[in-house]
């Protein structure tokens, strides 16, 4: 790794931000809006737009503000006490299991089956069973992988030694 | 980074190991102090801030003090016993942004605690 | 005081196959997570920071993912160099958190 500094390999206090506002910390903590100096002396305020932090803490740096993916609307933006709040565009969802992207709302539900709800930002549409008004998840079932055995193991290309 | 005052001591003798920098001020860099026994992991000692501030990890304390110059960091071994018979690395932490990592390591010194 | 748990501690796969190497910390440390590699007789060598951001030189067969309490770190596309033990930290966020190290994960490149 270089020797060579640059500002962004300087601690938090030592780069220049002379906007930034300091204060003493209450018991070793410092208030939401603000990070712990490395001495532990002060409290620096986060910079608004740019990180955050939420509760009373001993953090060295702020936490950085979520941005905002393609597909997605920013409900309210980072302030200095709160992370940025984003959602799924119309018509698409996030589900819990793959909070990671959002995925397009179903159209309509499977035959034999009624609408009972909508698409939401955190759910698909929702579909039961005319008959017996059981849920349907819209997962496609898996086709049970057949497994096959190799005959013997071939030579390894890594030697002992690594 | 190269540590040196690893040897051969008896338990209880005081040992102190230095940690010595080159390219790169002390006032703008964190170190930390990490070890491992022969054939074990990695285990996290300490830390001097930029500013001289330590940190210590919750067993470590009172057994370590760490303490530095403009060009070295050194690590006092207060009362060493057989289970500190290890590696020793001093490691320089780099300031990411929003993260702190060991980017840059010594080679490590060898402490061996015997009678 | 935190503890970092890691898993597997012993991992095999051939040539250009897909480790995965699993970490969890005891209380949430944000993306304050670091992964190293060491191989015998040398120091542990930077991977990765901040959870996912690969150290300079480091290949991008290494990725690594997570937040708050759980992480992973894969390498896919094995190569026979990649045999080593591999070890999450937390990383320095904290003034009364410990850099804690997993017990790490010997990876055996077949």
């Known amino acids: 790794e270089s020797a060579l500094i640059t500002q962004q390999d300087l601690a938090p206090q030592q780069r220049a931000a002379p906007q930034q506002k300091r204060s003493s910390p209450s018991e070793g903590l410092c208030p939401p809006g603000h990070h712990i100096s490395e001495d532990g002396r002060d409290c620096i305020s986060c910079k608004y737009g740019q990180d955050y932090s939420t509760h009373w803490n001993d953090l060295l740096f702020c936490l950085r503000c979520t941005r905002c993916d393609s597909g997605e609307v920013e409900l309210s933006p980072c302030t200095t006490t709160r992370n940025t709040v984003c959602q799924c565009e119309e018509g698409t969802f996030r589900e819990e299991d793959s909070p990671e992207m959002c995925r397009k709302c179903r159209t309509g539900c499977p035959r034999g089956m009624v609408k009972v709800g909508d698409c939401t930002p955190w759910s698909d549409i929702e579909c039961v069973h005319k008959e017996s008004g059981t849920k349907h998840s819209g997962e496609v079932p898996a086709v049970e992988e057949t497994v096959t055995s190799s005959p013997g193991t071939p030579a390894s290309p890594c030697s002992l030694s690594g | 980074v190269e540590e040196s005052g690893g040897r051969l001591v008896t338990p209880g003798t005081p040992l102190t190991l230095t940690c010595t920098v080159s390219?790169?001020?002390?006032?703008?860099?964190?170190m930390s102090w990490v070890r491992q026994a022969p054939g074990k992991g990695l285990e996290w000692i300490g830390i001097i801030s930029s500013s001289g501030t330590t940190y210590y990890a919750s067993w470590a304390k009172g057994r370590f003090t760490i303490s530095k110059t403009s060009t070295t960091v050194d690590l006092k071994v207060t009362s060493p016993t057989t289970e500190d018979t290890a590696t020793y690395f001093c490691a320089r932490e780099t300031y990411y942004g929003y993260s702190y990592a060991a980017g840059l390591w010594g080679p490590g010194t060898l402490v061996t605690v015997s009678s | 005081a935190l503890v970092m748990t890691q898993t597997p501690s012993s991992v095999s796969a051939a040539v250009g196959g897909t480790v995965t190497i699993n970490c969890q910390a005891s209380q949430n440390i944000y993306s304050n997570l670091a992964w190293f590699q060491q191989k015998p007789g040398q120091p542990p060598k930077l991977l990765i920071y901040?959870?996912?951001k690969l150290a300079s030189g480091v290949p991008s067969r290494f990725s690594g993912s997570g937040s708050g309490t759980e992480f992973t770190l894969t390498i896919s596309d094995l190569e026979c160099d990649d045999a080593a033990t591999y070890y999450c930290?937390?990383?320095?966020?904290?003034?009364?958190?410990?850099?804690?190290f997993g017990g790490g994960t010997e990876v055996v490149v077949k």
């Open positions: 901040e959870t996912s």
């Open positions: 930290q937390s990383s320095w966020h904290s003034i009364s958190t410990d850099c804690a």
């Open positions: 390219g790169f001020s002390l006032s703008n860099y964190a």
